[in-house]
Every structure is written in C-alpha cells, then in structure tokens.
C-alpha cells in the first residue's frame, strides 16, 4: 500500500523536514503551507488550521514561496537618469537600470541605485576602455601618431593621415594637414585646398597600440565615480 499523503498542517516525523512549499512552524510545531509568489501569510497556521494567504497590496511583492506576514515594498520610481526595465508587480520588484550614456556607480541586488554620466575624453585623449553598465569610461592620452579632436565617451585615438607633404603636422588633438605638391586640377583663386591623403585612414574600433617608448597603463584614469581627472570632462 502507498504511504498516506499528509495534508497540512501535520506533525513531521522526528528527524524529517517539511516538504517543498511547506515550512516548519516553531509555535504550532507543524509543517504548514507556504504562500505562493504574489501572496503573503495573512493568518499563520495552528495545529488544526493551515496558513491563510492573501494577495500582496499595490506597490508590494513577494518573489518566492514564503510565509512572511507582510509583502516587501517595491523600490521607489526610477529617477530621470534611469529606465524601468522591470515593472513592480505582485511577484517582482521594480528594476531600474541606467539610461544610455550613463553607468551604474552604485548597484543594488537587482538594478541600479545610483547612475552617473559616462566620462567624456576631451581632445587629445581617447577612450582606452569603453564604459559598461557598471564601469566608467577610461581615457588615455593619444600616443604619438594618433589624435582625437572630440569630447566624447566613445571616440578612440585615430592615426594621423599620412601625407606626401605635410602642411601642418598632426598632434594629439588634431589630424595632420597635407599639402598637394602636384594638384590634379587647377584651383580657383582663393579656393580652399582640401587635404589629399595618400591612403585612406583605416577605421579602428580599438585604441591603437602605443609605441613601446610611450607609457601605457600609467596614463589610465581611475574608474568609478571620481571627480573629472586629466583627459576627461564632466559634461
């Protein structure tokens, strides 16, 4: 004969534990039913009556099977620098994450407590390490032969264009300007002479390796919510 199924509440056998979705009530000394997610215990069990559950009120939730007398409060509404990626329901808390261009400076169990704007690398500096959901941009000075003329949280240092004849040498914040020694067509007087690169610049997606003479990591700026440092701007 199969063993009889015990209905809650029941006294567990000595040394045994209560079943899944049950808990041992210390006062009643019985195995009693838990409440399902989205509910809480309105009345705890006794020796003869099982747990009475009730739905969580608005703006409160329980995510797990439980016997808590009160549902948990959903977190406060997402701030202007955040987006709500999960709404508050009876079964789950609200989750706020940082909007594009921001990163999480102070995380919580789920989502973000405090967002901060991604650091922008000023001209002469490029992105050494891009920002992530939880880390700030790291800027580095553009190495010889590379430049960045933007204030950006995404732009890297790009190589100077290679000229046959250099009109203006490039520096960390400006590209080289080339001079055409043999114009392909006559120019009207006073016309602006556009630079004529010998070869098109390759589109790098990562910072170019620095020459061995240039220091590398010593230029990396600190991560995290720090005051704007050299090479970054708070804008």
């Amino acid at each position: 004969l199969p063993a009889q199924v015990a209905f809650t509440p029941y006294a567990p056998e000595p040394g045994s534990t209560c079943r899944l979705r049950e808990y041992y009530d210390q006062t009643a000394q019985m195995c009693c039913s838990k409440c399902s997610p989205g509910q809480h215990a309105k009345v705890f069990c006794t020796k003869t009556s099982d747990t009475v559950c009730d739905s969580c009120e608005d703006s409160t939730y329980t995510q797990l099977w439980n016997w808590v007398p009160e549902c948990l409060s959903c977190g406060s509404r997402c701030s202007s620098d955040q987006v709500e990626t999960q709404a508050c329901t009876r079964e789950q808390n609200r989750i706020c994450t940082c909007r594009p261009g921001w990163y999480c400076a102070l995380s919580k169990q789920e989502g973000c407590r405090l967002c901060a704007p991604l650091r922008k690398c000023r001209p002469g500096f490029g992105v050494a390490r891009p920002g992530t959901e939880t880390s700030d941009v790291v800027c580095k000075p553009c190495a010889p032969g590379t430049f960045s003329n933007t204030t950006s949280s995404t732009d890297i240092c790009r190589p100077h264009q290679i000229c046959n004849v250099v009109a203006i040498p490039g520096n960390a914040s400006m590209d080289a300007v080339c001079t055409s020694t043999s114009p392909t067509r006559s120019m009207a007087p006073g016309a602006v002479h556009l630079p004529q690169p010998v070869s098109t610049r390759s589109q790098h997606t990562q910072p170019t390796p620095e020459p061995s003479t240039a220091p590398s990591t010593s230029f990396l700026l600190p991560m995290g919510p720090s005051p704007p440092a050299e090479g970054s701007t708070g804008d």
């Epitope: 210390q26 006062t27 215990a41 309105k42 009345v43 705890f44 006794t46 003869t48 009475v52 007398p69």
Partner: antibody, heavy 119, light 106 residues
Framework: QVTLKESGPALVKPTQTLTLTCTFS??????????VGWIRQPPGKALEWLAH???????FYNPSLKSQLTISKDTSKNQVVLTMTNMDPVDTATYYC???????????WGQGTTVTVSS | DVQMTQSPSSLSASVGDRVTITCKAS??????IAWYQQKPGKAPKLLIH???TLQPGIPSRFSGSGSGTDFTFTISSLQPEDIATYYC????????FGGGTKVEIK
C-alpha cells in the same frame, strides 16, 4: 471599535483556583485568524505571557505554567475564560487579556484586573 | 523557551535626545518582534510589530530594526510624553516579553 475587559475576584486565597473572564467586542472568535490571550504583570515587574486560544480552538500555554492553566472560549458570548489552579502569593499581579492577530502579536489590550493572593 | 534580554533596564535622557533600546533573543526569531509602551497604571500599547512596521497613529520618531537574534528600538527625538516603560515581545516561537526599559527625562 475593538475593546476587551477583564473580570474576576480581586482577592484569592493560596491554593485556591482563580477564574478570570475576558469579555470583548469589535471582533469575533469565529473569524479566521482571531485569538485572545492572557498576560500578567506582578507589581513593578515585567509582562509574562500565560496562554491564548485561537478561533479554531487551538490553545497555547506558557510551558512553565502549563499544569496550572486552562483556557476556553464561548464564541456566542464573546468571552474567553482562564482558570489558574493552586494560586500562590507570587501569582499576585495585574492580569490582562489581549487580542492576538493572525500573525501572532497582541494588538489590543484590556485595562487589566488586579488579583492579590493572600490568606 | 526563547529568552529575551532587554537592555538597559532604565535610562535617563533629555528632551530631543535619541534613545536606543535593544533586545537579544536566545535563538533565531526571524523578524517576529513587537515593541510596546506602558505608562503607569495603564495597559501596554502596541507601537511596532514585525520588527519595523509602525502601528497606525504611532509617531514616526519611533522605529525598529534587526533580525535573527538582535533587535533595536529607537526614539529619534525624545518627547516628554514618551516617558514610559518599553517592552519587546518575541512571537517567533511561542511568546516571551523582555524585562522592560524604564525611560525617564533628565
């Protein structure tokens, strides 16, 4: 409005049995989750839980006083009765009845009744 | 039986002071603790249940915290009407009161 009121003798002799009645209004012991309990407080001392009874007639007693205590209810009269046998002068105290919620804390209390045990 | 050790047994503080009372349970009681205020000759009055849930009508200067075995009750700014004895009650395993804390004004 929830109210509770204790009644019983002000004086009992040692070895006698004390019978206290709690008469309440504003709730019913036929409602799931409702309970009534008894707590006492000797003069100048702390509160001590004695016993209580639930809507489904489940009863709980303070383990150190269990042999002396009996609790019962009369749902139709809105009353709970506590009897305590073999009274001793150390049982001199103010006795309170209180409503207990479904999640087990005392929320409403009676005004208390003072019981002196003396020969 | 769960024992509740409440401290201090008495304290004297000035109006506006922050007052803190602690209760320590002899075993884990989750968050099942309530706090009561009792004035001389009166019945206890429920202030807080489930560690930190304030009863309706109770001023927000009263608060509670803790879980497991260590619990704290705080009056953020003591008022003359707060002069009373305060008791903790554990209800995680039967029911046990703490020994009480008598709060007086300096």
């Amino acid at each position: 409005q929830v109210t509770l009121k204790e009644s019983g003798p002000a004086l009992v002799k040692p070895t006698q049995t004390l019978t206290l009645t709690c008469t309440f209004s504003g709730f019913s012991l036929s409602t799931s989750g409702m309970g009534v309990g008894w707590i006492r407080q000797p003069p100048g001392k702390a509160l001590e839980w004695l016993a209580h009874i639930w809507w489904d007639d489940d009863k709980f007693y303070n383990p150190s006083l269990k042999s002396q205590l009996t609790i019962s209810k009369d749902t139709s009269k809105n009353q709970v009765v506590l009897t305590m046998t073999n009274m001793d002068p150390v049982d001199t105290a103010t006795y309170y009845c209180a409503r207990i919620t479904g999640t087990r804390y005392f929320d409403y209390w009676g005004q208390g009744t003072t019981v002196t045990v003396s020969s | 039986d769960v024992q509740m050790t409440q401290s201090p047994s008495s304290l004297s503080a000035s109006v506006g002071d922050r007052v803190t009372i602690t209760c320590k349970a002899s075993q884990d009681i989750n968050k099942f603790i309530a706090w009561y205020q009792q004035k001389p000759g009166k019945a206890p009055k429920l202030l807080i249940h489930y560690t930190s849930t304030l009863q309706p009508g109770i001023p927000s200067r009263f608060s509670g915290s803790g879980s497991g075995t260590d619990f704290t009750f705080t009056i953020s700014s003591l008022q003359p009407e707060d002069i009373a004895t305060y008791y903790c009650l554990q209800y995680g395993n039967l029911w046990t009161f703490g020994g009480g804390t008598k709060v007086e004004i300096k």
